[in-house]
Each structure stands twice: as C-alpha cells, then as structure tokens.
C-alpha cells in the first residue's frame, strides 16, 4: 500500500476528478494536457506515451465539450489509413461520423485538432503543439 | 458525516483535483465552467453566485495557464471603479500589474476575458458568454 498517501472524503454536492497526472486538466474524469513545445506527430505521440497517456482522442461532443473552446491547432491521435481511406485513432478505432469535421490544411496522414470539433489534415512531419489525454477508469 | 459518501486512496504518481461542482473543469485545484448562454455582466455574476462560485478571477499566469488557450470572449469578474479609475475583482482586490492586457472594446465598466490573458472593456449590459470559477481551499 506504499503508493498511497491520502484518504479524502468527498461531499455529495461536489466531486473530485481524476486521478490525473499532477497539474493536468481534469474534466468529466478525463485528463488533458496541452503542450506548448512544437513536435511532429510521431514525437508528440511518443511524448504522450512517456507520460502514460495518448494523443487526444475525440469520442464524445458531450463528454468533451470543453474542446469547443480550444484555440489554435494541436496534434491529436487521428491518422489516415491510405489503404482504405479511413481515419482512425491510435487505439485502432475508426472515427465516428459527425464527431469531427475534417478539412485539409495540406496533404498528409495526420490531423490537428482545432476549436469546435474541427480536424485539419497536415503532414505528419510538421511540428505543432499537441494535446495528451488520459482516460481514467 | 451524512454528506460524505466516498473514501478514495490516491497514488503518489497521480492526484485527484477538486472538489468541484459536478462536470466542472478542474485545474491546479481551481474549478472552472464555461457557460454558453449569453447574459449581461450582472446576470452572469448572479448565475455564478447561485452555483457557489464567482465570475473568473485571473490571479496567476502560472496557475491559470489553461486560460491561454481559451477561444472567444467571456465575462469575467473584473469591474472598473470610476471614482479612482482602477480595475478590481468581485472580491474587492485590485487587478495586479502585468496580469492582463486591458483593451477597450467599447466604453464600459466591465471586462471580457479573451485568450492569452487579454481583457476587453465592454458595456456591462451587453450579453456575452461567461466563465465561473470556484477556488478550492
């Protein structure tokens, strides 16, 4: 039990969110962090993985409505599969219809998240800021 | 002890955030919520107060760096005191130097928060979206 160091009691009127890595944003029990340093998609993915997280996965407009207000463009975990033309997440799941509107910024197989649930296609080797996400159980 | 219903153990590698009102954003133990419906400043303040919160107070670029990425304009808890020309928060504290860049949108005594720590002066009776904030102890 050595990893645990706190016991907290939670009032019914309020709730704790998490657990998340320290100083990450917690919303509806998902953890998010925005990273300022620009990396290409592969480096961004590696950075998230090193923190036991993945690049942003958009799975619900309701549970992730905080993403509506995000400014600028950031790598997310969505990649194009040229063989069948589909877009899929790092975990292999296919992008659901009407979750994101995908627009070509330039030819590429990776996607940047932009406000209001838009995704912009970009060359995977271009450096951009990125969003990591960790889903709590 | 009737208000409490959970006991949780927190690993040292991760941490819980809060407590916050249900479905609010928690970041560095502050709680934030963005409200879509447009209200004037006074109605926005009343809405936050009804939820045991206040309009957004910007007190630290470090602790509130998530605000850098906020898109659009939203009422915050900053008002102009015509008698001495200062800007102060709802709790009576004076706006610290270099925290916000204040820009006149139009003549007024209230301020909208915009990305990258900018504040836009606006007529208090104009409807806008708003940000409520609750500081955890």
């Amino acid at each position: 039990n050595s990893l645990f160091n706190q016991e907290v009691q939670i009032p019914l009127t309020e709730s704790y969110c998490g657990p998340c890595p320290k100083n990450w944003i917690c919303y509806k029990n998902n953890c998010y962090q925005f990273f300022n340093e620009s990396k290409n998609w592969y480096e961004s993915q590696a950075s998230c993985m090193s923190q036991n997280a993945s690049l942003l996965k958009v799975y619900s407009k309701e549970d992730q409505d905080l993403l509506k207000l995000v400014k600028s463009y950031h790598w997310m975990g969505l990649v194009h599969i040229p063989t069948n033309g589909s877009w899929q997440w790092e975990d292999g799941s296919i992008l659901s219809p009407n979750l994101l509107t995908i627009i070509e910024m330039q030819k590429g197989d990776c996607a940047l998240y932009a406000s209001s649930f838009k995704g912009y296609i970009e060359n995977c080797s271009i450096p951009n800021t990125y969003i990591c996400m960790q889903r709590t159980v | 002890n009737s208000l409490f219903n959970q006991e949780v153990q927190i690993p040292l590698t991760e941490s819980y955030c809060g407590p916050c009102p249900k479905n609010w954003i928690c970041y560095k133990n502050n709680c934030y919520q963005f409200f879509n419906e447009s209200k004037n400043w006074y109605e926005s303040q009343a809405s936050c107060m009804s939820q045991n919160a206040s309009l957004l107070k910007v007190y630290s670029k470090e602790d509130q760096d998530l605000l850098k990425l906020v898109k659009s304009y939203h009422w915050m808890g900053l008002v102009h005191i015509p008698t001495n020309g200062s800007w102060q928060w709802e709790d009576g504290s004076i706006l610290s130097p270099n925290l916000l860049t204040i820009i006149e949108m139009q003549k007024g005594d209230c301020a909208l928060y915009a990305s990258s720590f900018k504040g836009y002066i606006e007529n208090c009776s104009i409807p806008n979206t708003y940000i409520c904030m609750q500081r955890t102890v």
Partner: antibody, heavy 121, light 108 residues
C-alpha cells in the same frame, strides 16, 4: 443512385429574400457535408457555402457572408439556402452538391441540375 | 485568400492529348479536384485527390500535381470531351473552397 433536386429559384427584387431547397436521396444524407455552388451567366463556378453532416459547421464565401444562411434538415434529407439582402450580382444558377468523403470536406462527387435565381428590378 | 489560375482556353485535335493546368502557390501540398461541365449541364467530377478517378470516368482522364502546378491530362481526346474544366481545392487557412477560373477545351 444519388439524386439532388434543387427548387425555390425565381425572380426577386434587389434587397429581397429567397429560400432555396435541395431534396436528396440515394445516400445516408446525415453523414455527408453538403454545399451550394453558383454560376453567373457566362461565368465560372463560384463556391457559396458548405455545411457539415451534423450541421455543426458552416462556412461561407466572403461575398455572401452575413447575407446567406445554409442549413439542413436531416430528418427530411433536405438542404437549404436562405438568401437575404439579395443583389444583382447574386444572379446565377445555384447548384447543390454532395461531398465525396463522408468524414472530410474535400470534393463534390454529385451535383443537382441547378435552379436559376434572378435578382432584378 | 488562395488563388487558382487556369488558362482560359485549350485547343486540341481529336485523338491527341490535352493538358489543362491549374496554378497555385505550393499547390502540390494540396489535394486538387477536377470537374467537367458541358454546355447547359451541371458539373461532373472527373478527377479527385490529384489523380483518382470516380467510377464511370474513362481512364483517358488522369491528373498530376506537384510544385506550383496541377495538371489534368486527357489522352485520345474525343469530340465529346469538349467542355469547360475547373480545378478546385480546399483552403484550410481560410476554410474556403476555391475554384479555378475554368478552361474551355475545344476539340478542333
């Protein structure tokens, strides 16, 4: 087979309004973005507006922004274009077209036959 | 905003190859789509994503795209290919669809 049928065109005075409709069939309407493209007499194609499958995202050409509103009713498989404050330069054949990729704004795979809008006093 | 430049007209004899260009700043980094519009008819997509053909479009129609120029090539031109041809891209910076001015293909 994909079918797109525009209606609602006609003669209108400058400053007036008109609402175009596009009835769609032969595909799952709600997952495809739809667009309006116009063509003035003897001129080239000009994009007007596009709307995502869910209706969450709308984009407009600068020439119509603030005057035209694109919308859709996915329960009726119908696309609309509300045109207000019409000008003589809005005179054109208006085509509705279906996006070629269900998840992406890319190209226009299917087109209707068009409806003529004439703005004149 | 992004601009696409096409020659107003191209003429070719039947059986020859027609090449219609579409110029734009670094257009090779964008996916280009081509439409054919015959007189009095609605446009028809003939090439998308630079070089892919929709079903029903003859193999004689092909596309390429690099640098600052995209090209629609029509080999073994037939009289029925006489039409206006338009290139199109998405400008992701402005969230606008952009069409070229169109090229009238005349079969001599």
């Amino acid at each position: 087979e994909v079918q797109l049928l525009e209606s609602g065109g006609g003669l209108v005075q400058p400053g007036g309004s008109l609402r175009l409709s596009c009835a769609a069939s032969g595909f799952t309407f709600s997952i495809y973005a739809m667009t309006w493209v116009r063509q003035a007499p003897g001129k080239g194609l000009e994009w007007v507006s596009i709307i995502s499958g869910s209706g969450d995202h709308t984009f407009y050409a600068d020439s119509v922004k603030g005057r035209f509103t694109i919308s859709r009713d996915n329960s009726r498989n119908t696309l609309y274009l509300q045109m207000d404050s019409l000008r003589a330069e809005d005179t054109a054949v208006y085509y509705c077209a279906k996006e070629g990729k269900w998840v992406q704004l890319s190209h226009f795979a299917n087109w209707g036959q068009g409806t003529l809008v004439t703005v004149s006093s | 905003s992004y601009v696409l430049t096409q020659p107003p007209s191209v003429s070719v004899a039947p059986g020859q190859t027609a090449r219609i260009t579409c110029g734009g700043n670094n257009i090779g980094s964008k996916s280009v789509h081509w439409y054919q519009q015959k007189a009095g008819q609605a446009p028809v997509l003939v090439v998308y994503d630079d070089s892919d053909r929709p079903s029903g479009i003859p193999e004689r129609f092909s596309g390429s795209n690099s640098g600052n120029t995209a090209t629609l090539t029509i080999s073994r031109v037939e009289a029925g290919d006489e039409a206006d041809y338009y290139c199109q891209v998405w400008d992701g910076r402005s969230d606008h669809v952009v069409f070229g001015g169109g090229t009238k293909l005349t079969v001599l």
